[in-house]
């Protein structure tokens, strides 16, 4: 019947959605200093929102324990932030310790579910 | 100047975004059997996409290690799925082993950053 066919289509779509959209780029805040590995610099804001892969993989499959959600495509994006550096006292005028700078952070554009096991036969 | 004010506004917004949107409801696939703690029942689909809290908290703060992203509001939502139960041989006719059923799964509607330490003085 129409209802049975509709239910089958709906269930197939739900099944597909659970596999397809459980490992996707998501918002994470990253500490700029840690991300850029810079010790003696302070940024404002301290943290920025980036897209990183998250979620889970292989739900309902035999190998789900061996599967992780990894970046399949990473791009570097520019962000304009304020950078403060330790100021040194100058003879003439004040040290310029603050500047607007462009920094690059990794953003994950595509996420893949990768499994370290072999596929089930 | 206008440019300085605009930069300040933009940076404040970036700062706010990193705090506001790093702990939010996100897609996760959950195994229905495990979620409902039912051992001898099979569902199709095996897994469904639900909204669960994820991301990170307290980036750039002293206490960030003590902060977790938790559900601030959880709602139960209905999902129509196929349920297969182990069939028993009946005297008259075949056992009805398959049925469309409504199941309830938790969805996180709001996420809060909960920190176990005291706020910094």
């Amino acid at each position: 019947s129409y209802h049975d066919r509709k239910s089958k289509v709906d269930l197939d779509r739900l099944n597909d959605d659970a596999k397809r959209y459980s490992c996707t780029p998501r918002n994470y805040s990253v500490n700029i200093r840690e991300e850029l590995k810079l010790a003696n610099v302070v940024f404002f804001p301290r943290c920025l929102l980036v897209q990183r892969c998250g979620g889970n993989c292989g739900c309902g499959t035999v190998n789900w324990r061996s599967c992780t959600c990894n970046s399949g495509k990473t791009v570097k994006k520019y962000h304009e932030v304020l950078q403060f550096e330790p100021g040194h006292i100058k003879r003439r005028g004040r040290a310029k310790t603050m500047a607007l700078v462009d920094i690059q952070l990794d953003h994950h554009e595509r996420c893949d579910c990768i499994c370290s096991s072999r596929p089930p036969r | 100047s206008y440019h300085d004010r605009k930069s300040k506004v933009d940076l404040d917004r970036l700062n706010d975004d990193a705090k506001r949107y790093s702990c939010t409801p996100r897609n996760y696939s959950v195994n229905i059997r495990e979620e409902l703690k039912l051992a001898n029942v099979v569902f199709f689909p095996r897994c469904l996409l639900v909204q669960r809290c994820g991301g990170n908290c307290g980036c750039g703060t002293v206490n960030w290690r003590s902060c977790t992203c938790n559900s601030g509001k959880t709602v139960k939502k209905y999902h129509e799925v196929l349920q297969f139960e182990p069939g028993h041989i009946k005297r008259r006719g075949r056992a009805k082993t398959m049925a469309l059923v409504d199941i309830q799964l938790d969805h996180h509607e709001r996420c809060d950053c909960i920190c176990s330490s005291r706020p910094p003085r």
């Epitope: 596999k19 397809r20 993989c57 292989g58 499959t61 190998n63 061996s66 599967c67 992780t68 990894n70 970046s71 399949g72 495509k73 893949d112 579910c113 990768i114 499994c115 370290s116 096991s117 072999r118 596929p119 | -």
Partner: antibody, heavy 127, light 107 residues
Framework: QVQLVESGGGVVQPGRSLRLSCAAS????????MHWVRQAPGKGLEWVAI????????YYADSVKGRFTVSRDNSKNTLYLQMNSLRAEDTAVYYC????????????????????WGQGTTVTVSS | DIQMTQSPSSLSASVGDRVTITCRAS??????LAWYQQKPGKVPNLLIY???TLQSGVPSRFSGSGSGTDFSLTISSLQPEDVAAYYC?????????FGQGTTVEIK
């Protein structure tokens, strides 16, 4: 049986081009990521490039970026490596190897190393 | 990019000896590590994948362990046919870097 056969190697002058081919048989070629790996005389293995199962994504070693192009024709079960602006340091045996398996029904990539290798084809860049 | 460092670069051992080769990744790669054997004049052959899973057809004297950044390949009892170069490789994302290799010889 599962097999990879490379061809197209030879002696070429610096700055010239060469195209290597790798014919696959015995498996569903269009479900696998495919690699090129090379080995200079007396040296270790060097990963060169990978192409995704569908040809949409390609990644290269820094040493060949901008000079080499990997491609595939799934209808012919064939992998290619177009090598331009060849240098003496590109002299090596070039292997094609089968990489990950992509399960399109579960959207899962199975990464378990390179389990099938071709016999290799020799490229000599010399004036 | 993640670097893979193998040690030692070569070793010589007696038949029956237990031999261990180590591989270190400059950043964590979970268990996405493979080991290959390449006998003189031959094509490389996959020995171990997922850091510790033996490829079918590989003798059980070979074993792998480790996770994250530190990995090892062990031959429990070295045989004459094990004379070869051994390579580790990260296999979770580009670049699929190999270690520089370890040559195993019989004393």
């Amino acid at each position: 049986q599962v097999q990879l056969v490379e061809s197209g190697g030879g002696v070429v002058q610096p700055g010239r081009s060469l195209r290597l081919s790798c014919a696959a048989s015995g498996f569903t070629f269009s479900s696998y990521g495919m690699h090129w790996v090379r080995q200079a005389p007396g040296k270790g293995l060097e990963w060169v490039a990978i192409i995704w199962y569908d040809g949409n994504d390609k990644y290269y070693a820094d040493s060949v970026k901008g000079r080499f192009t990997v491609s595939r024709d799934n209808s012919k079960n064939t992998l290619y490596l177009q090598m331009n602006s060849l240098r003496a340091e590109d002299t090596a045996v070039y292997y094609c190897a089968r990489g990950y398996y992509y399960d399109s029904s579960d959207y899962l990539y199975y990464y378990y190393g390179m389990d099938v290798w071709g016999q290799g084809t020799t490229v000599t860049v010399s004036s | 990019d993640i670097q893979m460092t193998q040690s030692p670069s070569s070793l010589s051992a007696s038949v029956g000896d237990r031999v261990t080769i180590t591989c270190r990744a400059s950043q964590g790669i979970s268990n996405y590590l493979a080991w290959y054997q390449q006998k003189p004049g031959k094509v490389p052959n996959l020995l171990i994948y997922a850091a510790s899973t033996l490829q079918s057809g590989v003798p059980s004297r070979f074993s792998g362990s480790g996770s994250g950044t530190d990995f090892s390949l062990t031959i429990s009892s070295l045989q004459p046919e094990d004379v070869a170069a051994y390579y580790c490789q990260k296999c979770n994302s580009a670049p699929w870097t190999f270690g520089q290799g370890t040559t195993v010889e019989i004393k």
